[in-house]
């Protein structure tokens, strides 16, 4: 309705002359008033007092003259629909309507893509009263635009709760072209293929798009933007980087690096972090990832005494958190550890072999055969056993632990003897008579007591008898022997 | 690549601080050294710096410098300079070290990236 | 603390000729084979040669050759190029001791 009322609409004439060019002397505007921090209405003056404008709301009186005539439709008049300018230029447009002395608080405000502008804009609004009507031209200026000044603007008026609104002004900021989308650095596989992607945008339009590789161009003819670029493959790392133009000039990406995926480096740090009888909990710092993920590191370990196997036993875990416990190792042994770690691509190379040892532990065994027998004559219990395998003494023997329980009607009591490492037998006094004597041997180090042997029972009869045999360590699955004399 | 900075004439018992500032690789990925060069006299290890921060001396260098780092640099401070300590200081990358936590020492592998060195003269 | 004994210096020999540098240690060093030698040109930094007794580092041509284990190390260069004068470093590390020993030093003049 609006758009009709203004085609019909014959613009009340503001005065002689060329509008708004030179204007006359005696039209020279009552009031600008800039418009530093927002948009104040723009200001209405009673032409009965020129050239004193009113400060404040400005009542104009209704026209209540029988003799008046309908008044026209308001409308903004015609102005440039379209400008076309460079970036970081300066630009000026305006708007300009003449209302009727009538008409009362009317305001004027500026619209871009449908969203009022609020703000520090340079706006300025000019007041140019006359007898029957008050042109007024709203001027919009800024001052060095930037792409984002790109778009439609327009005023409105309101008036008597009727809103009127110009005709669009169209800005378009033209520059070099502006990138949307920049190619990306990449880790690829050697000799894979791969795509990078190049988006630039005007005004002005069209934007054309050169790769460039290590400095020389890709393709001789351009594309038009968007741009993908499929490289075939890659055998060592390259630079890529995009060329948009435009009727303005060029402008050139940023160069993105794409690195070749390889094996990893190995380790540069291995750290010994604890050492028990069995074993050692080590921590890494990986090399260089070969621009792909580390997935999972392996731990090398292998006995360092010369005249073991050379096996190597090998742990693999997890690369995270760089941080291993080798377990089922032997007690005071020496080991050689490394450490390689993995991505998608393969195995880095092992770190350089390091040294780490396990402390004394317990022994894991028992003495073997332990033999137990009464001997009479000197009222003592003779003990015999071997020694465990040194294999599985887990240190270095400093002797032996034994314990003998003497057991009779009612009455328990267990003694504890130390017995040197040299020996494999040992004599203990008789307890109690008329009683049974369960004895254990455990080897020591200084790692420890070791488990104790299967106990052997003998039993020590009253003065007076005679007959003694020995008592030893059962076989297997037998029920725990005891010989009575 | 590795840089050394911070070399100048100074007083005895002025205290001075050398920088190395790496590029290329970080600090908290490899562990770094100091060694240093009297006027046509050979090289003498100074201390190092773990990946993680630990810090280990030369016996005779000890309490005679101070070897801390950030990201990207590592510093060596010389608490009080004495004419013995003429000498180019060099940073150097540490290939490999192996750490014993548990006994509060450590070994290097090999020293496989240098920098060019910055001379400080000591002199009253 | 452990000290490393470089022999001879200065030692010269002719353009494609041989020159072995020995290198003594006082004790074994780590793992018996983490010793490693330096090459130093004057006015410039010293440079990575051989590590693991006788890994060669990258770069570093095949006429370099390093041998030994323990406590006894040597370098060999064979076919000698005038860009081989310089001055060598032998280096380890020593179990139970951070310390990092350099040798002496071997001055190799090229005729």
């Known amino acids: 309705a609006i758009t009709e009322a203004r085609e019909e609409a014959k613009p009340y004439p503001l005065f002689p002359g060329p509008f708004p060019g030179s204007l006359q002397t005696d039209h020279t505007p009552l009031l600008s008033l800039p418009h530093a921090s927002g948009y104040q209405p723009a200001l209405m003056f009673s032409p009965t007092q020129p050239g004193r404008p009113h400060t404040g709301n400005v009542a104009i009186p209704q026209v209540t003259s029988v003799e008046s005539k309908p008044l026209p439709p308001l409308a903004f008049k015609h102005t440039v629909g379209h400008i076309i300018l460079s970036e970081h230029k300066g630009v000026k447009f305006n708007c300009s309507i003449s209302v009727p002395n009538i008409y009362q608080d009317t305001t004027i405000s500026w619209w871009k893509d449908g969203k009022e502008l609020l703000g520090a804009h340079h706006a300025i609004t000019q007041f140019y009263p006359d007898d029957e009507v008050t042109a007024i031209i709203a001027s919009f200026s800024i001052t060095s635009v930037q792409r984002s000044d790109n778009g439609s603007y327009i005023c409105k008026m309101k008036i008597n709760n009727e809103e009127i609104v110009s005709d669009p002004i169209y800005i378009e900021v033209q520059g070099l072209p502006h990138f949307t989308k920049q190619p990306e650095s990449m880790n690829v596989t050697r000799n894979t293929a791969f795509n990078l992607t190049c988006q630039a945008v005007g005004p002005p339009e069209p934007v054309n798009i050169f790769w460039v590789q290590n400095s020389s161009r890709v393709n001789e003819q351009p594309e038009k933007s968007p741009s993908v670029l499929t490289v075939p493959g890659l055998t060592e790392m390259a630079v890529f980087s995009c060329e948009a133009h435009n009727d303005k000039g060029l402008t050139v990406s940023k160069g993105v690096q794409i690195n070749i995926k390889a094996i990893p480096s190995p380790p540069t740090e291995v750290s010994i972090r604890n050492s028990t009888a069995h074993s050692i909990l080590i921590s890494w710092v990986p090399g260089f990832d070969g621009y792909s993920p580390f997935r999972n590191c392996s731990i090398q370990v292998k006995e360092a005494d010369p005249l073991s196997n050379g096996s190597v036993m090998i742990f693999n875990t997890s690369a995270l958190p760089h941080l291993y416990q080798i377990k089922q190792l032997q007690a005071l042994a020496n080991y050689s550890i490394g450490v390689s770690c993995m991505n998608e691509i393969g195995w880095s190379a092992v770190s350089p072999w390091i040294l780490a040892s396990t402390t004394e532990g317990a022994p894991s065994v028992a003495p073997l055969n332990v033999t137990v027998f009464l001997n009479e004559s000197s009222d003592n219990v003779d003990i015999r056993w071997m020694k465990p395998p040194t294999k599985q003494q887990d240190g270095e023997l400093v002797g032996y632990r034994i314990s003998h329980v003497w057991q009779s009607a009612g009455i328990s009591k267990e003694l504890l003897e130390e017995v040197g490492q040299n020996g494999s037998r040992a004599r203990i006094s008789v307890q109690v008579h008329n009683a049974t004597c369960t004895v254990r041997i455990a080897a020591v180090t200084r790692g420890g007591v070791g488990p104790f042997s299967d106990p052997v029972k003998i039993f020590i009869p009253a003065h007076g008898w005679v007959d003694y045999a020995p008592s030893s360590t059962p076989a297997p699955g037998n029920a725990d022997p005891v010989l009575i004399i | 690549s590795v840089e050394e900075s911070g070399g100048r004439l100074v007083t005895p018992g002025t205290p001075l601080t050398l920088t190395c500032t790496v590029s290329?690789?970080?600090?908290?990925?490899?562990?770094m050294s100091w060694v240093r060069q009297a006027p046509g006299k050979g090289l003498e290890w100074i201390g190092i710096i773990s990946s993680s921060g630990s810090t280990y001396s030369a016996s005779w260098a000890k309490g005679r410098f101070t070897i801390s780092k950030t990201s990207t640099t590592m510093d060596l401070k010389i608490t009080s300079p004495t004419t013995e300590d003429t000498a180019t200081y060099f940073c150097?990358?540490?290939?490999?070290?192996?750490?014993?936590?548990?006994?509060?020492?450590?070994?290097?592998?090999?020293?496989?990236?240098w920098g060019q060195g910055t001379l400080v003269t000591v002199s009253s | 603390a452990a000290v490393l004994t470089q022999t001879p210096s200065p030692v010269s020999a002719a353009v494609g000729g041989t020159v072995s540098i020995s290198c003594q240690s006082s004790k074994s060093i780590y793992n018996n084979n983490w010793l490693s030698w330096y090459q130093q040109k004057p006015g410039q930094p010293p440079k990575l040669l051989i590590y693991?007794?006788?890994d060669l580092a990258s770069g570093v041509p095949s006429r370099f050759e390093g041998s030994g284990s323990g406590t006894e190390f040597t370098l060999t260069i064979s076919d000698l190029e005038c860009d081989d004068a310089a001055t060598y470093y032998c280096a380890g590390g020593y179990s139970g001791d951070s310390d990092y020993a350099f040798g002496g030093g071997t001055e190799v003049v090229v005729k």
């Open positions: 693991d007794a006788s």
């Open positions: 290329g690789f970080s600090l908290s990925s490899n562990a």
């Open positions: 150097a990358r540490v290939g490999f070290f192996v750490g014993y936590g548990a006994y509060d020492y450590g070994i290097i592998h090999r020293l496989d990236l």
